[in-house]
């Protein structure tokens, strides 16, 4: 069966029907359907006016305008808001009411496209394998990235989040039109990796998507990841404005000037330094989502009530931090180079800047504890990788899972750890699953380009596609049309269980207590350390070109929700990856060609992008009680500095960095909290209280009715910021 021309809100579209084998199965493929009008720089996306006749949707459209790998020219186009659809078809009737999976690509909010890199004439994000193996519809799309997608003045002049709004437009288009392609508009699953995983998370939290999303999967990135929210957007807007010759003294004039500046110039005005960095790479990525009071109405930690009815899977790769650690400390991948205590201490101190000397020292001590017993270079290098994995991915993901679980009504929560090792031959043997290594398996590359892979890779890919598509169908990764290797139990705050995904999976793949000591360290010990003053905490920016100016620490609150503590050691689920990763060739000596790049260009991986290194605080305890968020409204972003001098100061962090005292027993009583004017608020129990969603504050497109003053809205202070 085949669809032929399909009528959409824009007009008729015609794709290609690709036959699969001799049994009569096929897949209808539509590439390049516009879901919004050609963009205007630094403005919200607008509906597409439509067309007459039948649009031939047979080729991918250009990606959104972005810098090339060398960052000295651009590629892509401003007219880029297009989507692609894969619809599996059986022999007889055209498909109806299929689950829909919408992919959001990663790339540090800086690069990427809906089709991904081309390798062996197969695009990374080609949805065919998922669609046909899982019997689901797959949709991918482009959204604006870099300054054009995320530049913001932190106020109404340039509110930012244009790329997130593009994503929402695509999701809403799918909701309105996918029935005509045979999809079920009431069963839409978002999935994405790294910045895409964080985007998935943010879309579930935004009130704009109320009623649009049924399920979501975040791979190596969540809204709470420390690189996701820019708390000082004006600093970065001014950097670009200065580069392109716009005035920076008055935000309104600056905004008007930026809007009429050549978009290519805006794109090239921002460069991420990739070598000789004075600070960890994440400090240099500035154009990411912001809390705009509308699309993202408050700090994401305060918005989990909005995702209460959305089934959720989140996870990480076991060495997600490897690629970033190797940029921050190149010795990691070099057998002849050593990592010293001094090197690691410097790195740690850069991530823990708001906690000053004590923060650096205690963190260093916790992470180097094993070095006395095992001073080998392998152990030291693994420690560096583990440190960045924890901070950038693992701990934030665990908190996101705990928050989802705590606020969920009917929704289910699942956690995973992807551990199938990287196949990059230039990496040391000890390297596990690097950032973005999971993508190729989710998209079925071992089947699509088999020469690059081994049978064990196909085993991993088959399992992931089965779990992912079963989840899209039913909300339970174990139930659906596809057999799975072992039962994946839901995540609960009592068990913090996670599925470890490897080439051999069985009952022992369900695990608990992942890196408990480190999780507990970040959520309790580190958090309780006093915050240092602005003067002590302000990093000295690198000299030379302004591209290398670090993002100053920008968090507005050191306090994070402190969940029950007990000693169960609930394991966090690590976050997953950002697709900026380099190509992943096979190991082994088969001579097989390398596995395709997992990012979307040959670009070196651009790291996560937020404004601070600190992970939020996940639950650690065995009390069984879900983490109980405080109710204060500390989610508001700090007012960014307005002067043009030097690096912006570290924003104030409140009078008390002390976290609320977590419950210690299983009484279910809310924890006692400080009563002064610290940033911790009294903590009411949340559970299934049915907190209303947090709405946008403007007269936004599809905002739910705002909660009344006496709503029991669950709120938390901002995630820890280093």
């Amino acid at each position: 069966a085949k669809l032929g021309a399909v009528y959409t809100e824009g007009g008729f579209v015609e794709g290609v029907n690709k036959k699969l084998g001799l049994l009569g199965d096929s897949v209808d493929i539509f590439k390049g359907i516009p879901f919004a009008a050609p963009t205007k720089a630094l403005e919200n996306p607008q509906p597409h006016p439509g067309w007459q006749g039948t649009l031939k949707a047979k080729n991918f459209k250009k990606r959104c305008l972005q810098a090339t790998i060398t960052q000295d020219s651009t590629y892509g186009d401003e007219d880029c808001l297009y989507l692609n659809i894969w619809v599996p078809q059986g022999r007889k009737q055209v498909s109806r009411d299929l689950p829909v999976m919408i992919w959001i690509y990663g790339g540090a909010f800086l690069m990427g496209s809906g089709h991904g890199a081309n390798f062996l004439n197969n695009y990374l994000y080609d949805g065919e394998e998922i669609a046909t193996r899982g019997n689901v519809i797959v949709v991918t799309f482009n959204y604006r990235v870099g300054p054009l997608g995320f530049l913001s003045t932190g106020d109404a002049n340039l509110p930012g989040n244009y790329g997130l709004r593009d994503q929402h437009m695509a999701i809403a288009w799918v909701k309105r039109n996918i029935a005509a392609f045979g999809g079920d508009p009431n069963n839409i699953t978002l999935f994405g990796e790294s910045a895409g995983g964080a985007s998935v998370s943010l879309q579930t939290l935004s009130p704009y998507n109320k009623g649009l999303i049924r399920r979501a999967i975040s791979q190596s990135g969540v809204a709470l990841s420390p690189w996701v929210i820019q708390k000082n957007p004006l600093f970065w807007a001014k950097k670009v404005a200065e580069k392109v010759g716009c005035p920076v003294g008055d935000a309104a004039r600056m905004a008007q000037c930026l809007k009429v500046t050549d978009p290519r110039a805006l794109t090239l005005a921002y460069k991420v330094p990739l070598a000789g960095l004075e600070y960890p790479m994440l400090h240099y990525v500035g154009f990411v989502p912001v809390i705009d009071g509308d699309f993202i109405p408050a700090d994401p930690i305060n918005l989990y009530a909005n995702a209460a009815d959305i089934d959720y899977i989140a996870g990480t790769n076991n060495m997600d931090g490897h690629i970033f650690a190797s940029i921050d400390m190149p010795a990691i991948n070099k057998g002849n180079k050593k990592v010293t205590e001094e090197d690691f201490y410097k790195l740690v101190s850069e991530f823990t800047i708001t906690k000053g000397l004590r923060g650096a020292k205690t963190t260093f001590d916790v992470y180097t504890e094993s070095w006395a017993q095992d001073p080998s270079q392998e152990n030291k290098k693994k420690t560096v990788v583990d440190f960045e994995t924890d901070v950038l991915f693992l701990v934030p993901t665990e908190i996101a899972l705990a928050q989802h679980r705590a606020n969920a009504k009917s929704a289910k929560t699942y956690a995973y750890l992807f551990s199938h090792p990287s196949r990059m031959p230039v990496y040391p043997k000890w390297v596990g699953a690097d950032h973005a290594d999971d993508i190729q398996y989710v998209f079925g590359k071992p089947f699509a380009t088999p020469t690059g892979y081994r049978p064990q890779d196909r085993t991993v890919s088959k399992a992931m596609i089965a779990y992912w598509t079963n989840f899209a169908k039913t909300g339970d990764p174990n139930m659906g049309d596809s057999a799975v290797p072992t039962h994946w139990e839901p995540y609960t705050t009592e068990n913090s269980g996670y599925l470890e995904i490897t080439k051999k999976m069985g009952s022992s793949s369900m695990k608990r207590s992942l890196r408990t000591n480190f999780l507990r360290y970040w959520t309790l010990t580190y958090l309780a350390l006093p915050t240092v003053t602005d003067q002590e905490a302000t990093p000295v920016p690198p000299t030379g070109d302004s591209e290398a100016t670090p993002v100053p620490p920008t968090g507005d609150s050191e306090t994070a929700p402190v969940p029950p503590t007990g000693d169960s050691g609930a394991p966090p689920v690590p976050p997953t990856g950002d697709s900026g990763a380099p190509p992943v060739p096979p190991t082994g000596d088969s001579g097989a060609p390398p596995v395709p790049p997992t990012g979307d260009s040959g670009a070196p991986p651009v790291p996560p992008t937020g404004d601070s290194g600190a992970p939020p605080v996940p639950p650690t305890g065995d009390s069984g009680a879900p983490p109980v968020p405080p109710t204060g409204d500390s989610g508001a972003p700090p007012v960014p500095p307005t002067g043009d001098a030097g690096p912006p100061p570290v924003p104030p962090t409140g009078d008390s960095g002390a976290p609320p005292v977590p419950p210690t027993g299983d009484s279910g009583a809310p924890p006692v909290t400080p009563t002064g004017d610290s940033e911790t608020a009294p903590v009411p129990p949340t559970g299934d209280s049915g907190a209303p969603p947090v709405p946008p504050t403007g007269d936004s497109e599809a905002a739910p009715v705002p909660p009344t003053d006496d709503s029991k809205e669950a709120q938390m202070p901002a995630v820890i910021r280093f």
């Epitope: 032929g4 021309a5 399909v6 009528y7 959409t8 809100e9 824009g10 007009g11 008729f12 015609e14 509906p47 597409h48 006016p49 439509g50 067309w51 007459q52 006749g53 039948t54 809403a172 288009w173 909701k175 309105r176 039109n177 996918i178 029935a179 005509a180 704009y208 009623g211 649009l212 497109e701 599809a702």
Partner: antibody
């Protein structure tokens, strides 16, 4: 100027079929989609489906799938809407309507054809 | 299908009055159109893309809104404006509101 002229009223028995025509003039016939909308007595408007006169592509509302067929004759700039297995609740005025521009609203309408289904 | 809820279903007003009719979409939509229909006649396009006036339509008619909530406003009613008004969304399966009958008070 754009004109859409529909065929005359029809009276049909339950179970029969009806074929309503809509002749277009004043513009390039193959350049704009043609929709069919009906209105039962005293009721609101209900979209039936759409045809692209250029290539004959069609899309029908779920409710009418299997019972409706839209065709076109480019030589006479006419589109047709055939509805089969008629029942009394199909009694309505049937309108053809052309897109205004792009895939925009229904900017030009025929005068309507009353189809009465009665035993 | 996308649901379109129009309110009020009927409305009495006098010549010279300012009148507002609302239409709510669930879920949100891209574009909304408004039509006027007089008894025994075909509908006539008034407003398209939420706020754009179709050619030949008097400027006393205006439209606004986005996403889920839309309004049609007639700033100063004229005798010829008494009719039934419909909102309409275009998705892959277009739908109309149930109509608002505007009568003389």
């Amino acid at each position: 100027q754009v004109q859409l002229v529909q065929s005359g009223a029809e009276v049909k028995k339950p179970g029969a079929s009806v074929k309503v025509s809509c002749k277009a003039s004043g513009y390039t016939f193959t350049s704009y989609n043609m929709h069919w909308v009906r209105q039962a007595p005293g009721q609101g408007l209900e979209w039936i489906g759409v045809i692209n006169p250029g290539d004959g592509a069609t899309s029908y509302a779920q409710k009418f799938k299997g019972r409706v067929t839209m065709t076109r004759d480019t030589s006479t700039s006419t589109v047709y809407m055939e509805l089969s297995s008629l029942r009394s609740e199909d009694t309505a005025v049937y309108y053809c309507a052309r897109d205004y521009y792009g895939s925009s609203p229904l900017g030009y309408w025929g005068q309507g054809t009353l189809v009465t289904v009665s035993s | 299908d996308i649901q379109m809820t129009q309110s009020p279903s009927s409305l009495s007003a006098s010549v010279g009055d300012r009148v507002t009719i609302t239409c709510r979409a669930s879920p949100s939509i891209s574009y909304l159109n408004w039509y006027q229909q007089k008894p025994g006649k075909a509908p006539k396009l008034l407003i398209y893309a939420a706020s754009k006036l179709a050619s030949g339509v008097p400027s006393r008619f205006s439209g606004s809104g986005s996403g889920t909530d839309f309004t049609l406003t007639i700033s100063s009613l004229q005798p010829e404006d008494f009719a039934t008004y419909y909102c309409h969304q275009r998705s892959s399966s277009p739908t109309f509101g149930q109509g608002t009958k505007l009568e003389i008070k």
